[in-house]
């Protein structure tokens, strides 16, 4: 199963950690994809490690663990984020987070 905070908020200009927690007694994680709506942010694979999409390379830092740290947030970053865990032999598990970026006070 995937466990995640459904709704999170952060300040404009700040950073936020996007985290999905996968728990299974048997399945091993082989790949994790992170998307902002339909756009890929980063991908982790056991073979190749982390790769961050070039369009986000100055704002997205892999980690902690299989999560992402999203920096220099703008109001346009408000929206849905999806983690997809590819596991063996368990199959594919998805999690959803809604991020609300608020104006800095």
């Amino acid at each position: 199963t995937i466990d995640t905070k459904r709704n999170i908020s952060a300040e404009e200009g700040g950073s936020v950690i996007l985290q999905c927690h996968f728990s299974s007694d048997t399945a091993e994680v082989t790949q994790v994809d992170w998307k902002q709506q339909d756009q890929l942010l980063a991908i982790y694979s056991v073979d190749l490690g982390w790769h961050v999409a070039s369009v986000f390379s100055d704002r997205v830092v892999p980690g902690p663990s299989l999560g992402l740290t999203f920096q220099s947030l703008t109001m346009n970053d408000t929206g849905e984020y999806f983690c997809t865990y590819h596991t063996y032999p368990g199959g594919i598990y998805k999690g959803r987070i809604f991020l609300k970026v608020q104006e800095s006070s």
């Epitope: 790949q31 994809d33 890929l40 980063a42 991908i43 694979s45 056991v46 073979d47 190749l48 490690g49 982390w50 790769h51 961050v52 999409a53 070039s54 390379s57 997205v60 830092v61 892999p62 980690g63 663990s65």
Partner: antibody
Framework: EVQLVESGGGLTQPGKSLKLSCEAS????????MHWVRQSPGKGLEWVAF????????FYADAVRGRFTISRDNAKNLLFLQMNDLKSEDTAMYYC????????????WGQGTLVTVSS | DIVMTQSPSSLAVSPGEKVTMTCKSS????????????LAWYQQKPGQSPKLLIY???IRFTGVPDRFTGSGSGTDYTLTITSVQAEDMGQYFC?????????FGDGTKLEIK
Amino acid sequence: EVQLVESGGGLTQPGKSLKLSCEASGFTFSSFTMHWVRQSPGKGLEWVAFIRSGSGIVFYADAVRGRFTISRDNAKNLLFLQMNDLKSEDTAMYYCARRPLGHNTFDSWGQGTLVTVSS
Amino acid sequence: DIVMTQSPSSLAVSPGEKVTMTCKSSQSLYYSGVKENLLAWYQQKPGQSPKLLIYYASIRFTGVPDRFTGSGSGTDYTLTITSVQAEDMGQYFCQQGINNPLTFGDGTKLEIK
């Protein structure tokens, strides 16, 4: 400033062992995958081994698998390469190198330590 | 293992000239997961360790002068130096990141006339 400093190289005979060390500073060592890459005199670069940050996953080049062991001590910011049953073809400059967080390259290199295997 | 073939093996140019070197891989370096080509270029000056110049085939690494340009996709890649300077002398290596073991080309040696 990221710094990687290798040590432990030297002259040794075929069949003997050496242990290389790489001291890291200027970054959160425990968060990064680390590699050993070697370069024979006047030749190109050859990747040797890597060790992942959290998982400790390791991978070796065929030429060294079963003879070399990569390890790390995150508390002391140290990377190691234990080299056993050395052969003359292992003679090279050995570099430790850092993999950046977002792509499969080497963004920081040490100055290297020279290993010479000769009878 | 993926074989990386660089050409030419060496070249000599005068300061200010444009230089092009190529790197061919034995299989595609396109990673559909991240929609990037996993090809990097390094510069190694005599007596020094290599330095990362380009990653994802075309993105200049931090602090790399804009006279260095990477291009290409699939199996064919190019590094261009638009106006060569004396300090650009050295060896240039390409490296693939799509498969373990990671592999390098044999290098192109750039000499300044």
